[in-house]
Amino acid sequence: AITEAREEAKPYPLFPGPFPGSLQTDHTPLLSLPHASGYQPALMFSPTQPGRPHTGNVAIPQVTSVESKPLPPLAFKHTVGHIILSEHKGVKFNCSISVPNIYQDTTISWWKDGKELLGAHHAITQFYPDDEVTAIIASFSITSVQRSDNGSYICKMKINNEEIVSDPIYIEVQGLPHFTKQPESMNVTRNTAFNLTCQAVGPPEPVNIFWVQNSSRVNEQPEKSPSVLTVPGLTEMAVFSCEAHNDKGLTVSKGVQINIKAIPSPPTEVSIRNSTAHSILISWVPGFDGYSPFRNCSIQVKEADPLSNGSVMIFNTSALPHLYQIKQLQALANYSIGVSCMNEIGWSAVSPWILASTTEGAPSVAPLNVTVFLNESSDNVDIRWMKPPTKQQDGELVGYRISHVWQSAGISKELLEEVGQNGSRARISVQVHNATCTVRIAAVTRGGVGPFSDPVKIFIPAHGWVDYAPSSTPAPGNADPVLII
C-alpha cells in the first residue's frame, strides 16, 4: 500500500530506526557530501571481495565473511510513498540503505520520471559507517516547490555493475487551477453564435469552470474543465472571463472583449497629392474598420461645374495603400471627390467631399481644316486653319506652332514658327523655289504643345510661274493630302 503524507503531517524521521550494527540516530555522520549545485554520486569504500551480479531491485551478496555468515540482500528501506503539498512550500525526502563494508565504488543517484537529476538540485548523501555495514542516507530537498516538481522520484544505487532501485516517492504539488486555455478576444457578426473555450488543470482535480459575461455568471452551476461556451449571439460588445475552481481556491482568466463587426467609419483626410491635366492622385486616412478588415474602397468623382449633368464616376480600388490615381479626367476642370470603403459587413458612408482641379494640359487635338496656298506676288505661303474645339484645347490657348519643311533636290530643312492665339492664319516667306513645302500646325497652351495636324504639301515652282490653287487638309477619313495645282 502507498503511504501518504499530507503537508500538515509531522516531519518524518530521516530513516525509520537504528541501522544494523546498532547505529544510533544521534550518531554524527562520518562523511557528509552536500550537493547544492549539481548532484554527484557518492563514493563508497573498498571492498575485500567483489559481489556476484544479480538482476532486479535487490542484490543478494553471495560472499561470506571470515566467519562464513551469508550477507543479507541489499535493498532500499521503505519510506513515505506519496507527499502532497501546496505550491511554494518546502519538501525534503530521502532514501536509506545499509551496505556491507566489503563493497566498493558504490554510487547513489536521484531520478525523476525516468530521468536522472543532474542539475541544480539540493541533494545530500550522508554515510554512517559501522563495523560491518555503512548506513547511507540520500536526502533530496526542494525549498519552494512548483508544479514542474510533480512526479515520481527514485534512488538508484550501483554496486559492482548491479543496480538497486528504491520504491518511488510520488510528489504531488497542489495549487490553484492553472489555465491551459483561456478565452480569446474575437470580432463577431451581430446576432451570430460563436464559441469560447476555457481549460484549467490542478492538481487537485477536478477543476470546475464558471463563465462570466459582463460581470454576470452565465452558468449557475460549475462545468467540468474543459468547458466550451456557445454564446448565442451578441448585439453589443461584451466582456467574457472564466473562473476555474478547485479545492485550493479560484483562479480567474483574463477578461476578453468580444466586439461586434459593423460597417466601417468613413475615411477621413482625403487629400490631393498630385494633379495633372487628366489625372488626380489622392490619398486618404481610413476610418475605423468596424472590427472587420477593409476589403476595398470606392472613389466617387463628380464634376463640380454647376452646368454639368451631375453624373458620378466611380473607381474601385484595393483598400491599401490608401492612394489612388484618378485617370481619364478633363483638363482644367473642377471635381468633387469622395471616398468610401467596405468590409465584410458593408460600405462606409462617403468621406467629406473635397474639391480638386486638373491642371492645363497640352491640347488633345490639332487645329482643323488647314489650308495652304502660294501667294507668288509676295513670295509668301499663306496658311489658314480653324482652332480646335474649346473642350479639346485642355487649357487656355496661347498660340500655335507651325512646322514647315522645305524639300528640294535631296535637301530638307525644317523651320518652326510661333504665332499668337488671336488669329487663325499665318504667312511664311518662301524659303526655296522649285521645292515642296510641307506644313503642319499644333495648338499651344501653357500645358504644352498639342499634336500636329496632318501634313499639307504645296509645290513652290521656279520664278515666273502662275499662282496655284490652295492645298488643304482632307476631310476626316480621306487619304493623305494631295497637292492641287
Epitope: 446576432n191 463563465w211 459575461q213 459582463n214 454576470s216 452565465v218 452558468n219 449557475e220 452551476q221 460549475p222 462545468e223 461556451l229 448565442p232 449571439g233 448585439t235 461584451a238
Partner: antibody
Framework: QVQLVQSGSELKKPGASVKVSCKAS????????VHWVRQAPGQGLEWMGW????????TYAQGFTGRFVFSLDTSVSTAYLQISSLKAEDTAVYYC???????????WGQGTLVTVSS | EIVLTQSPATLSLSPGERATLSCRAS?????MHWYQQKPGQAPRPLIY???NLASGIPARFSGSGSGTSYTLTISSLEPEDFAVYYC?????????FGGGTKVEIK
C-alpha cells in the same frame, strides 16, 4: 429523454406544511440547477428561486424566504420544495424547471397544484 | 430587480395574421427568453437568448431586440398559437418574468 416529474396535487389546511417533489431523469442531475416557479390562479409566472444541485446551496427570491425551503436528494435525483405555515395566498401551481446557461429554463415539470383551504 | 413590462396585455387576432409582442425591461439586459403557456399546461420554452428557437419550435416564431426592448413575432398565426406568452430576462438576479401577453382569437 429529459423529464421532470412532480408529485401530485395537495389540499392543505392553513398552518400546515407541504413538500412538493421534482424527480429528474434523462440527464446528470448534479450538472444543472433546479428552479422553482409559482403561478397563482389566473396570474402570471413568479420566480421563487433555485437550488444548486452540485453544492446544495439554495437561492431565494425576495418574498420567498423563511417559510420556503429548497432541498435535494441527489441519490434519487430529486429536488424538493417545502412550504411551512401555509396561508390561503399560497394556493398556486408550483413548477420546477431545469436551469441551463443564461438562466434559461429548458425543461419544466408538469406542475403541482397546492390548495390551502380551511 | 429588473421589471419586465409586456404589451399589449391581450392581443386579439385571426389565424394567418401577424402577431408582434413587446417586452420592455426597466434596465438593460443581455438576453431575453420567451415561453408559451396554454391553459392547464406547464410553460413551454419558445425562444432562447433573444433570437434562438427552442427545440421543435416552428420557424414562424422569431425573436429580436437588445438593451431594454425585445420583441416576439409570430409571422402567421396558427390555431395552436393562441396562448399566453411570457418573457424572462437574464442579466441579474432575481430572474424575473414579464406579466404575460394573451394572444386570443378575434
Amino acid at each position: 429523454q429529459v423529464q421532470l416529474v412532480q408529485s401530485g396535487s395537495e389540499l392543505k389546511k392553513p398552518g400546515a406544511s407541504v413538500k412538493v417533489s421534482c424527480k429528474a431523469s434523462g440527464y446528470t442531475f448534479t450538472n444543472y440547477g433546479v428552479h422553482w416557479v409559482r403561478q397563482a390562479p389566473g396570474q402570471g409566472l413568479e420566480w421563487m428561486g433555485w437550488i444548486n444541485t452540485y453544492t446544495g446551496e439554495p437561492t431565494y427570491a425576495q418574498g420567498f424566504t423563511g417559510r420556503f425551503v429548497f432541498s435535494l436528494d441527489t441519490s434519487v435525483s430529486t429536488a424538493y420544495l417545502q412550504i411551512s405555515s401555509l396561508k390561503a395566498e399560497d394556493t398556486a401551481v408550483y413548477y420546477c424547471a431545469r436551469g441551463y446557461r443564461y438562466a434559461y429554463m429548458d425543461y419544466w415539470g408538469q406542475g403541482t397544484l397546492v390548495t390551502v383551504s380551511s | 430587480e429588473i421589471v419586465l413590462t409586456q404589451s399589449p396585455a391581450t392581443l386579439s387576432l385571426s389565424p394567418g395574421e401577424r402577431a408582434t409582442l413587446s417586452c420592455r425591461a426597466s434596465s438593460s439586459t443581455s438576453y431575453m427568453h420567451w415561453y408559451q403557456q396554454k391553459p392547464g399546461q406547464a410553460p413551454r420554452p419558445l425562444i432562447y437568448a433573444t433570437s434562438n428557437l427552442a427545440s421543435g419550435i416552428p420557424a414562424r416564431f422569431s425573436g429580436s431586440g437588445s438593451g431594454t426592448s425585445y420583441t416576439l413575432t409570430i409571422s402567421s398565426l396558427e390555431p395552436e398559437d393562441f396562448a399566453v406568452y411570457y418573457c424572462q430576462q437574464w442579466s441579474s438576479n432575481p430572474r424575473t418574468f414579464g406579466g404575460g401577453t394573451k394572444v386570443e382569437i378575434k
